[in-house]
Interface confidence: low
C-alpha cells in the first residue's frame, strides 16, 4: 500500500535568465528511494540513482545541475522553458510516486512566487 | 517477476570485440534505466555502461570509446558492443535495472580477454 506524499515547490516563477530550484520531498512512507527522474512534459532532465548518483541528460547538461539533495537547479532560464516538471521517485517497496511543479519564466522583474528557492 | 538474462560471453584475444545481451522480462522495459557492471576476480563490482530511455547512454571512463550500450525497446533486449578489448576487461559481466526495486541482477556473463 502506498502511504508516502510528494511535497513540491508548487507552482512558481522566476525571471529570463536567472536560476531556480526545483525540489521535491517524499514523506510518510519508510519506502527506499532507489532512483529520482527529473522530467519537463515527456523529455528527461536528470536522474538521482542510489547505486550511479547523478546523471544529467545531455541535451540540458549546460542548463541544469544537480541538488540541492535530490532537487534540480535550472539555469539561464529561458521563456521556452515555462511548463510542467515532474519528480518521479521510484521506491521499494511501495512503487513509484510523481510530484508536479509548473514552472513560469518571465520577462521582467515581476517574478513573486517561489522565491525562497531562487538563486540570487 | 523480473528477470535478466545475459549471453554473450567468452574468451576473446585482446584487440577484439564482443557482443553482451541481457533479456529482459516482467516489467516496462522502455520506461526503465538499465546498465551493465562487471567483477572481476578479486575486485568490487563497478558500473561500465548506462542507458535510460530516450537513448541516453552513459560510459565508465575506462570503457569510453571502446564500449557501446544500447537498447532494443521492441526486444526487451540491452546490448553491450565492446570493442577493442583488453586483458583489464576480463570479468563477469552483469546486466542490471532499476524499476523500483533496490536492484535486480542477472546471473552475469563471464569475459575472458587473453592470448
Known amino acids: 500500500m502506498m502511504t508516502g506524499t510528494i511535497e513540491t515547490t508548487g507552482n512558481i516563477s522566476a525571471e529570463k535568465g536567472g536560476s531556480i530550484i526545483l525540489q521535491c520531498h517524499l514523506s510518510s512512507t519508510t519506502a527506499q528511494v532507489t532512483q529520482v527522474n527529473w522530467e519537463q512534459q515527456d523529455q528527461l532532465l536528470a536522474i538521482c540513482n542510489a547505486d550511479l548518483g547523478w546523471h544529467i541528460s545531455p541535451s540540458f547538461k549546460d542548463r541544469v545541475a544537480p541538488g540541492p539533495g535530490l532537487g534540480l537547479t535550472l539555469q539561464s532560464l529561458t521563456v521556452n522553458d515555462t511548463g510542467e516538471y515532474f519528480c518521479i521517485y521510484h521506491t521499494y517497496p511501495d512503487g513509484t510516486y510523481t510530484g508536479r511543479i509548473f514552472l513560469e519564466v518571465l520577462e521582467s522583474s515581476v517574478a513573486e512566487h517561489g522565491a525562497r528557492f531562487q538563486i540570487p | 517477476e523480473v528477470q535478466l538474462v545475459e549471453s554473450g560471453g567468452g574468451l576473446v584475444q585482446p584487440g577484439g570485440s564482443l557482443r553482451l545481451s541481457c533479456a529482459a522480462s516482467g516489467f516496462t522495459f522502455d520506461r526503465s534505466w538499465m546498465g551493465w557492471f562487471r567483477q572481476a576476480p578479486g575486485k568490487e563490482r563497478e558500473w561500465v555502461a548506462s542507458v535510460l530511455r530516450g537513448g541516453y547512454t552513459w560510459y565508465a571512463d575506462s570503457v569510453k570509446g571502446r564500449f557501446t550500450i544500447s537498447a532494443d525497446n521492441s526486444k526487451n533486449t540491452a546490448y553491450l558492443q565492446m570493442n577493442s578489448l583488453k586483458p583489464e576487461d576480463t570479468a563477469v559481466y552483469y546486466c542490471?535495472?532499476?524499476?523500483?526495486?533496490?536492484?535486480?541482477w542477472g546471473q552475469g556473463t563471464l569475459v575472458t580477454v587473453s592470448s
Open positions: 542490471v535495472t532499476d524499476v523500483g526495486a533496490p536492484d535486480y
